[in-house]
Interface confidence: medium
């Protein structure tokens, strides 16, 4: 039934980009400016996203294809598809309601976005601290004490996990 | 009401290093970020970098080793610092506030005037 | 860096008349323009941003458009207290850039 009813309608053979136009004979109309359709079959472009004020644009819309948008400089997107931008902190720092405030003892953020996050606890894995934290860093975790027995040999220290970075400035 | 003021020596020598405070009042430097731009004498606008809200700051790459930015935002201060200074940093200095919807200044210091001389 | 550049660098006008300022981005910078108009002897204040968005109170004869690369500034119908220095300012990435500027003066 579904394939009769697609082969009957002449709006499915409208491709992404274009429109099906019941104003002429639904003819497959190309999207107007500033609109786009990224699935085929559709009556209506969507308009495109506009990437004003604090925001700017990161790709520009296309006839298939919505514009995306990322932060001007000295913000950081928010949410999904950058809703939202919030201006950036200090690496050590994470946003509060009254401002950037300094990451308390035992956590860090090595990031201008985001909390600050606790310190690896490098005892949970038997290892010692080769670094100690602050608070734009984490630790560095070393071998367990029992590794460094004479004779034993030397381990490289793995390098902190990082989170992926904000939308690039 | 938003204001900014800039205060500085007004004649520096060359090689020193320049200090000018800007003094904000009807907005908190909690919130906002505040730019600094100078202008020679009948010449046009320069951007000489910004203090964002949480301290971070941005400087124009033409002069990041000699711009310091910090402020005190308990004073509702921010200090601008240029070092090794030559004729041509004879400028008027503006502080400028940047407002949360662009990366822009909307309201301005009546600037100071800066002369390098020796 | 991002060049501004705008033209003329001068212009002369009538009270009433419509005026066009240019500017030029060396590359794509979206919307992220604004404008400034600065008096001698004054600071530049705030006009427009986001290439079209007037800033609070300034009047509705100043339009801004434009998009992409090439920007205008207009003012649909001069007023004597118009005649000043106007600039334009890209925020699209680092370092912040201005126009050189476009004195606007009586004929």
């Known amino acids: 039934f579904e394939r009769t009813r697609s082969l009957q309608d002449p709006c499915s053979n409208c491709p992404a980009g274009t429109f099906c136009d019941n104003n002429r004979n639904q003819i497959c109309s190309p999207c107007p400016p500033n609109s786009f359709s990224s699935a085929g079959g559709q009556r209506t472009c969507d308009i495109c996203r506009q990437c004003k004020g604090v925001f700017r644009t990161r790709k520009e819309c296309s006839s298939t294809s919505n514009a995306e948008c990322d932060c001007t400089p000295g913000f950081h997107c928010l949410g999904a598809g950058c809703s939202m931008c919030e201006q950036d902190c200090k690496q050590g720092q994470e946003l509060t309601k009254k401002g950037c405030k300094d990451c308390c003892f035992g956590t860090f953020n090595d990031q201008k976005r985001g909390i600050c996050r606790p310190w690896t606890n490098c005892s949970l894995d038997g290892k010692s601290v080769l670094v100690n934290g602050t608070k734009e860093r984490d630790v560095v975790c070393g071998p367990s004490p029992a590794d460094l027995s004479p004779g034993a040999s030397s381990v490289t220290p793995p390098a902190p996990a990082r989170e992926p970075g904000h939308s690039p400035q | 009401q938003v204001q900014l003021q800039e205060s500085g020596p007004g004649l520096v020598k060359p090689s020193e290093t320049l200090s000018i405070t800007c003094t904000v009042s009807?907005?908190?430097?909690?919130?906002?970020?505040v730019h600094w731009v100078r202008q020679p004498p009948g010449k046009g606008l320069e951007w000489l970098g910004v203090?964002?809200?949480?301290?971070?700051?941005d400087y124009n790459p033409s002069l990041k080793s000699r711009v310091t930015i910090s402020k005190d935002t308990s004073k509702n201060q921010v200090s601008f610092k240029l070092s090794s200074l030559t004729a041509a940093d004879t400028a008027i200095y503006y502080c400028?506030?940047?407002?949360?919807?662009?990366?822009?200044?909307?309201?301005w210091g009546q600037g100071t005037l800066v002369t390098v001389s020796s | 860096d991002i060049q501004m550049t705008q033209s003329p660098s001068s212009l002369s006008a009538s009270v009433g008349d419509r005026v066009t300022v240019t500017c030029r981005a060396s590359?794509?910078?979206?919307?992220?323009v604004a404008w400034y108009q600065q008096k001698p002897g004054k600071a530049p204040k705030a006009l427009i941003y986001s290439a079209s968005y007037r800033d609070s109170g300034v009047p509705s004869r100043f339009s801004g458009s434009g998009s992409g690369t090439d920007f205008t500034l207009t003012i649909s119908s001069v007023q004597p207290e118009d005649f000043a220095t106007y600039y334009c300012?890209?925020?699209?990435?680092?370092?912040?850039?201005f126009g050189g500027g476009t004195k606007l003066e009586i004929k």
């Open positions: 203090i964002w809200s949480g301290g971070s700051t």
């Open positions: 300012q890209q925020y699209n990435s680092y370092p912040l850039t």
């Open positions: 400028a506030r940047n407002p949360l919807t662009a990366t822009v200044m909307d309201y």
């Open positions: 590359q794509n910078v979206g919307t992220n």
């Open positions: 009807g907005f908190s430097l909690i919130s906002y970020g």
